[in-house]
């Protein structure tokens, strides 16, 4: 009862390999690395057949089919390029993930190269089967600012030079505060922007005083205060988080985070700002932007900005001591002794940024918080100091530069 000679499948082998096979002999069919046994459209690792009493084999020899990793997973804010001809997705094929430059960059400078493994999964040398991450690029506007002139009372900002600025707007389109985009779905603003003005006689924060996420919206890519343009993105609010140590009486820790319902499309007019890497030096020049009141108490038509120096903390404390106002460690002051250049009503929550010349990148130093009137002599603008609360911001948002 001898069974016919067996031919191993292409890219496969049979074991044991014998010259002759007799009744009850069994053989195991397996495939080379990167191939799978295919029998009746079912993939398996091995297949066993037996020599029957009547001298026939219990089954036909299966085929060996190359492993297919199939279409690779999509990468958020990324692209896939196939390194192999005809966009092959089979064993040993190679693909490369890249991020949508210049607005996204790959985390940890990963190569993004994935190879189709013998197990049928796309594998990267460092990340294994995990996909890379495309992080938003921060603080690198496409449009670079002309050198700032030392000018009185601010000047119109050039369009696109402050792509991180956010406008907090009532649903009727009335702006009420500023903010800055962090990462791909967070806005940092002033905590006092998210509640109604409190009664000085009873400065307690009640539920009814707080803005609900459905009460306002965020507008990014905005230039004109009231006019719309094609670069604007209007986004809903998912959740608001006030700093847990915020004090509405003293404006201590006057910072809040707004989580967006959806991520904006990053482009030349919408880009996040970088979080500070270290403390800010006294005398450093910063730029403050906003749609707040101008000289003569008028609101501007477009986004305005001023360039002012950071003021020594003790100088600022002394300036406010006669008013019995405390300038705490979570605050940073900026402005000129003679006054004239300052943030004002409507600017609250907006960004105070500085340029790191070595990297050519802009960093958030503070958010507009409070002051005594606007642009007064010997009364500096007081800002919530982002470096002081960077840990909290990162805890809540997970944003890293």
């Amino acid at each position: 009862n001898e069974c016919p000679e067996l031919q191993p499948p292409v890219h496969g082998k049979i074991e044991p390999s014998q010259a002759k096979y007799f009744f009850k002999d069994q053989v195991l069919v397996s495939c080379d690395t990167g191939y799978k046994v295919l029998k009746d459209n079912v993939e398996m690792d091995t297949f066993q057949i037996e020599c029957l009493k009547d001298g026939t084999w219990s089954n036909k020899i299966p085929t060996c089919k190359i492993v297919d990793c199939r279409a690779p997973g999509e990468l958020e804010h990324g692209l896939i390029t196939f390194s192999t001809r005809n966009n092959l997705t089979t064993y040993k094929s190679e693909i490369k993930y890249s991020c949508q430059e210049p607005y996204y960059k790959m985390l940890n400078n990963n190569t993004g190269i994935y190879t189709c493994s013998a197990q049928g999964v796309w594998m990267n040398k460092v990340l294994g089967r995990s996909l890379p991450t495309c992080l938003p690029v921060c603080g690198l506007p496409k449009f670079s600012r002309k050198l700032m002139a030392r000018i009185f009372n601010g000047r119109p900002a050039q369009k696109g030079t402050t792509p991180w600025i956010a406008m907090l707007s009532h649903l009727n389109g009335q702006p009420f505060c500023g903010g800055s985009l962090l990462g791909s779905s967070w806005i940092v603003t002033a905590a006092h922007c998210l509640h109604q003005s409190l009664d000085p006689e009873d400065p307690t924060l009640r539920d009814s005083d707080l803005l609900s996420p459905s009460d306002f919206k965020i507008i990014l890519g905005k230039h004109w205060r009231l006019r719309s343009d094609e670069n604007e993105q209007h986004l809903g609010v998912k959740h608001t988080t006030l700093h847990p140590q915020y004090d509405p009486n003293t404006f201590e820790n006057d910072v809040a985070l707004v989580e967006l319902l959806e991520s904006p499309v990053l482009n030349a007019f919408v880009m996040p700002i970088c979080l500070p890497e270290g403390p800010q030096q006294e005398g450093a020049m910063v730029i403050v932007s906003g749609w707040g009141k101008q000289f003569l108490q008028r609101f501007p038509e477009t986004l305005m900005e001023i360039e002012i120096p950071i003021v020594d903390h003790s100088t600022c404390q002394k300036a406010y001591a006669p008013l019995k106002k405390k300038v705490t460690r979570d605050m940073i002051c900026a402005g000129e002794k003679e006054g004239g250049k300052d943030a004002c009503a409507g600017d609250a929550g907006g960004p105070m940024v500085t340029l790191n010349r070595e990297r050519g990148q802009w960093y958030l130093v503070g958010t507009v918080s409070w002051g005594d009137d606007c642009g007064k002599k010997d009364r500096y603008g007081v800002y919530s100091y982002i470096h002081h609360n960077k840990d909290w911001i990162q805890r809540v948002t997970g944003v890293r530069n």
């Epitope: 905590a191 539920d207 988080t241 847990p244 140590q245 201590e252």
Partner: antibody, heavy 113, light 112 residues
Framework: QSVEESGGRLVTPGTPLTLTCTAS????????MNWVRQAPGKGLEWIGI?????STWYASWAKGRFTISKTSTTVDLKITSPTTEDTATYFC??????????WGPGTLVTVSS | AVVLTQTASPVSAPVGGTVTIKCQAS??????LAWYQQKPGQSPKLLIY???TLVSGVSSRFSGSRSGTEFSLTISDLECADAATYYC??????????????FGGGTKVEIK
Amino acid sequence: QSVEESGGRLVTPGTPLTLTCTASGFSLSSAYMNWVRQAPGKGLEWIGIIYASGSTWYASWAKGRFTISKTSTTVDLKITSPTTEDTATYFCARDDYGTADLWGPGTLVTVSS
Amino acid sequence: AVVLTQTASPVSAPVGGTVTIKCQASQSIGSSLAWYQQKPGQSPKLLIYGASTLVSGVSSRFSGSRSGTEFSLTISDLECADAATYYCQNYYLSSSSADRRTFGGGTKVEIK
């Protein structure tokens, strides 16, 4: 880094009592400090917090019954007019963005006539 | 003010088992929730903040999660040393300026 409470003792109802919290390894003047209490066999109850600036916030049930204050080296909790319900272990705990990351061992206050 | 309602005590599980404690917030508090462990005669110890971030030095057997206003603390591969009372704490700045921090009632975990 550590904190320690002191001043807990047996007092008669209505007799004001001040508890003190001292710290080592960090400065209380720039810290945010909570007071929390725990009655025997019961859960934790937040009393209030004092900010770096010195401003204070209290739980609604604690307003008027407790006063938190600070010096450069201590944070104090005054129980203005203790009642038997104020018998508890009182903890001071450093506030780290809303969470209490460093606790003292607690000091026991017993209010009894 | 935000009210936190915890799983009723005691919760019992064997050594090597898994236990999950729940904490329900009366309103949306985002992820502003922490978990503490308190052993008899000791002060509380912070385990988790931001609903799911483990404090440095705390065993990875502890994990936290959030689903809307319901928060969970899971302890896996239970050890005798895990026998304690666990508290959730809210630090979301919302309603009144009072009650800036609130604790749940606590859940006692017993190891069989």
